[in-house]
């Protein structure tokens, strides 16, 4: 069977939504009313990987686009990027590790840890309109906690 994928949106713990910023970048900003339609809808795939009650391995693609969030080294630093893939081959159950995030939910906090780079998390800045990035610190200035809203296909 193909991998099961469900559509969802994400908001950080400051209630900022994620939107496209150019062809290969996401940014986080507060949206209201009609502007909410700008937010990115992810296709979250339940992929192969180590799993527990609190931790589920997922891949985060952009709905109806052949773009996936991936984690790679750039200038020796783990970096979040949007990577273009061949839609004939993706999504799949055995995603390459750079595409895999551990969705971790504990005490109303949802984090996305890179499987490729443990202890690095999808992060947003406190400031408005800044890029979504891969951060190596939790509990600091940058935001690593999200809420997730599943949406009908």
């Amino acid at each position: 069977a193909p991998v099961r994928s469900l559509n969802c949106t994400l908001r950080d713990s400051q209630q900022k939504s994620l939107v496209m910023s150019g062809p290969y970048e996401l940014k986080a900003l507060h949206l209201q009313g009609q502007d909410m339609e700008q937010q990115v809808v992810f296709s979250m795939s339940f992929v192969q990987g180590e799993e527990s009650n609190d931790k589920i391995p997922v891949a985060l693609g952009l709905k109806e686009k052949n773009l996936y969030l991936s984690c790679v080294l750039k200038d020796d630093k783990p970096t979040l990027q949007l990577e273009s893939v061949d839609p004939k081959n993706y999504p799949k159950k055995k995603m390459e590790k750079r595409f895999v995030f551990n969705k971790i939910e504990i005490n109303n906090k949802l984090e996305f840890e890179s499987a490729q780079f443990p202890n690095w998390y999808i992060s947003t800045s406190q400031a408005e309109n800044m890029p979504v990035f891969l951060g190596g610190t939790k509990g600091g200035q940058d935001i690593t906690d999200f809420t997730m809203q599943f949406v009908s296909s």
């Epitope: 069977a1 193909p2 099961r4 994928s5 469900l6 559509n7 969802c8 339940f46 009650n53 609190d54 589920i56 939910e105 504990i106 005490n107 109303n108 906090k109 949802l110 906690d145 999200f146 809420t147 997730m148 809203q149 599943f150 949406v151 009908s152 296909s153």
Partner: antibody, heavy 119, light 107 residues
């Protein structure tokens, strides 16, 4: 033994609000995703709300989106459904059920609480 | 979304009979299907998940199978306590939807 006990149902006028509760026992509530499923009189089943085990993930079908809000208090082993702007078509028995988006099915159910929306 | 069409909507059978209920999905759901039993005045009860896996404590006379987008629920030897309405439900893509139910009566 797993127990789910719903309360808070009743008769309410269209446009008004109602809050349902579901008290749980017999399992570690904070480890399970939870849902509300309803059944209109003489009709089938409809899944109307979901919340993940920690409360960070939610889902609502289009029929109730923007009107219903699911929440939970893991310290009190209790699930809630806030229903606003109620309509006649929301009349149903509302069941609290264990399970949701990830597992996909509902393995434990409460006995249900009836909600009637009528002027 | 994916629609689940259940048939028949009602049926009568005798104790000891083999009973079959079918659910057809409007798209491929890859065995992401469950069956529930609802006896009159009670809450639904999970019987089968993943198309053919029996839930804990469910008697072995109940079984499930699949062929393409058709899913079959079978009671090998009907018992009086099996009088109920049976529902299928898919969980492949949101929204997860239920079939309209099959009411089973004893003749």
């Amino acid at each position: 033994e797993v127990q789910l006990v719903e309360s808070g149902g009743g008769v309410v006028q269209p446009g008004r609000s109602l809050r349902l509760s579901c008290s749980s026992s017999g399992f570690i509530f904070s480890r399970y995703d939870m849902s509300w499923v309803r059944q209109a009189p003489g009709k089938g089943l409809e899944w109307v709300a979901y919340i993940s085990h920690g409360g960070a993930g939610t889902y609502y079908p289009d029929s109730v989106k923007g009107r219903f809000t699911i929440s939970r208090d893991n310290s009190k082993n209790t699930l809630f459904l806030q229903m606003d702007s109620l309509r006649a078509e929301d009349t149903a028995v509302y069941y609290c059920a264990r399970g949701g988006v990830y597992k996909g099915y509902f393995d434990e159910w409460g006995q249900g609480t009836p909600v009637t929306v009528s002027s | 979304g994916i629609q689940m069409t259940q048939s028949p909507s009602s049926l009568s059978a005798s104790v000891g009979d083999r009973v079959t209920i079918t659910c057809r999905a409007s798209g491929n759901i890859y065995n992401y299907l469950t069956w529930y039993q609802q006896t009159p005045g009670k809450a639904p009860k999970l019987l089968i998940y993943n198309a053919k896996t029996l839930a804990d404590g469910v008697p072995s006379r109940f079984s499930g199978s699949s062929s393409g987008t058709d899913y079959t629920f079978t009671i090998s030897s009907l018992q009086p306590e099996d009088i109920a309405t049976y529902y299928c439900q898919h969980f492949w893509t949101l929204p997860y939807t239920f079939g309209q139910g099959t009411k089973l009566q004893i003749t």
